[in-house]
């Protein structure tokens, strides 16, 4: 069924997304979107003068906020306001429904059931994905964030779909395809989960996806002056050639046993290895 906008809502300047609504297009205002914005603030006889425009700024009127329910249109009277109700509604604020199921008030395939009490002539039982007294509102099912692990939610109307990130699967992306479960990192490496792909943090001296490749910390020849580098599990170790000292064999030792430096770094003795 087509949406029933508020009675009197300007067809040129207003529109509605749910029954009884009258939302204005840009440049128009008023309860029925009949007042141009550019002149509305200057036409009102009420209200204080605006310091910026010199126009009278409208004060709150009895129709502001639209007290008329169910699409009723509000008009100001000398004392208060008056609601003009659409067909099927009555009362001071059009709050009483005269609509019956025969009028087909339930939108989006909602099932209409006759109301049990006088104030409710009918009740709409909405299909999945819709809500509101007339099933006029689409439920944003993605707002519940049903997709896990950063999956993208798609509401297809008839169903929800989750578009999963790489490394995840399942209706709600709940399955981690490539985690550390059942995975072994060799040579003392530890498994690290991240981004849906398992990764091994390898022990010193090992590399590769599963730490099966031996990495040689001595490959860069860090020990100077012919010193020997050893790939010890605690870190690389330099054994200096005679006549040199330091963690990387960088300091010459004079024949009298003194370093070539003005003062040898503390803790370093001739032939000292790296700690």
């Amino acid at each position: 069924a087509p949406l029933v906008c508020r009675a009197g809502c300007s067809p040129e300047h207003g529109f509605c997304e749910q029954p009884g609504e009258c939302r204005c297009l840009e440049g128009w205002t008023g309860p029925l979107c009949t007042v141009p914005v550019s002149t509305s603030s200057c036409l009102s006889p009420r209200g204080p003068s605006s310091a910026t425009t010199g126009c009278l700024v409208p004060g709150p009127g009895p129709c502001d906020g639209n007290p008329c329910a169910n699409g009723g249109s509000c008009s100001e009277t000398p004392r208060s306001f008056e609601c003009t109700c659409p067909r099927g509604f009555y009362g001071l604020r059009c709050e009483v429904s005269g609509v019956t199921c025969a009028d087909g008030p339930c939108f989006n395939g909602g099932l209409c059931v006759g109301g049990a009490d006088p104030d409710s002539a009918y009740i709409c039982h909405c299909p999945p994905g819709f809500q509101g007294s007339n099933c006029e509102k689409r439920v944003d099912r993605c707002s519940l964030q049903p997709c896990r692990n950063g999956g993208l939610c798609l509401d297809l109307g008839h169903a929800l779909r989750c578009r999963c990130r790489a490394g995840f699967a399942g209706p709600r992306c709940e399955h981690d395809l490539d985690d550390c479960a059942g995975r072994a990192c060799a040579n003392g490496g530890t498994c690290v989960e991240g981004g849906g792909a398992h990764r091994c943090s390898c022990a010193l001296g090992f590399g590769g996806r599963d730490c099966r490749e031996r990495a040689d910390p001595c490959a860069a020849r860090p020990c100077a002056h012919g010193g020997r580098c050893y790939a010890h599990f605690s870190g690389l170790v330099c054994a200096c050639a005679p006549g040199y000292m330091g963690a990387r064999c960088e300091f010459p030792v004079h024949p009298d046993g003194a370093s070539a430096l003005p003062a040898a770094p503390p803790g370093l003795r001739p032939g000292d290895p790296q700690r």
């Epitope: 010890h232 605690s234 032939g271």
Partner: antibody, heavy 118, light 109 residues
Framework: QEQLVESGGGLVQPEGSLTLTCTAS?????????MCWVRQAPGKGPEWIAC???????TDYASWAKGRFTVSKASSTTVTLQMTSLAVADTATYFC???????????WGPGTLVTVSS | QVLTQTPSPVSAAVGGTVTISCQST????????LSWYQQKPGQPPKVLIY???NLEIGVPSRFKGSGSGTQFTLTISGAQCDDAATYYC??????????FGGGTEVVVK
């Protein structure tokens, strides 16, 4: 599982020659180690013979071993020890051992027995 | 480079303390590149301590190494029957030279 296995031991006559082989598994000599030979005569303590540094192929020998013993790298997983002019006093179990730093042997083979006898 | 171990043999009761000394004729490389090994018949030596005082992975904490330069000690606190073996010290010296001590036999009663 890193392992070393020696082979080539056996009975040899005095003044004879023998080549022992050390085969590594679970690692290769592409990393930098001292691959060494140590021997142990029956009822005696271990005695260092020689090492080859896999980083650059340089070799070091105990003073008594120079000239008669030669250590070399045959492949990325094998090291050999060539022994010449063998004497009865060279009878021992010969071990292959690896120094991975701080000058100690953290990995040993089970040893191979060399008997020099006429 | 000569390493001298004392005493040998040494006897201890189960739960007792064993102390083995190792003296070098010259300072080991870096003053602490000395290691200790345990050897049982028919097996290769097994490293216990490296760099004078560092316990090798998997070795019980009752084994303790100390010392520097030319004088080193291995202490076994709370000796077990399984500790009955021959113990060797081994030094590494400047110029890429290795040397072993003569060994100390430990008997646990």
């Amino acid at each position: 599982q890193e392992q070393l296995v020696e082979s080539g031991g056996g009975l040899v006559q005095p003044e004879g020659s023998l080549t022992l082989t050390c085969t590594a598994s679970g690692f290769s000599f592409s990393s930098s180690y001292d691959m060494c030979w140590v021997r142990q005569a029956p009822g005696k303590g271990p005695e260092w013979i020689a090492c080859i540094y896999t980083g650059d192929g340089s070799t070091d020998y105990a003073s008594w071993a120079k000239g008669r013993f030669t250590v070399s790298k045959a492949s990325s997983t094998t090291v050999t020890l060539q022994m010449t002019s063998l004497a009865v006093a060279d009878t021992a179990t010969y071990f292959c051992a690896r120094n991975s730093g701080y000058g100690y042997f953290g990995l040993w083979g089970p040893g191979t027995l060399v008997t020099v006898s006429s | 480079q000569v390493l001298t171990q004392t005493p040998s043999p040494v006897s201890a009761a189960v739960g007792g303390t064993v102390t083995i000394s190792c003296q070098s004729t010259e300072s080991v490389y870096g003053s602490d590149w000395l290691s200790w090994y345990q050897q049982k018949p028919g097996q290769p030596p097994k490293v216990l301590i490296y760099q004078a005082s560092n316990l090798e992975i998997g070795v019980p904490s009752r084994f303790k190494g100390s010392g520097s330069g030319t004088q080193f000690t291995l202490t076994i606190s709370g000796a077990q029957c399984d500790d009955a073996a021959t113990y060797y010290c081994q030094g590494y010296y400047s110029g890429y030279i290795y040397a072993f001590g003569g060994g100390t036999e430990v008997v646990v009663k």
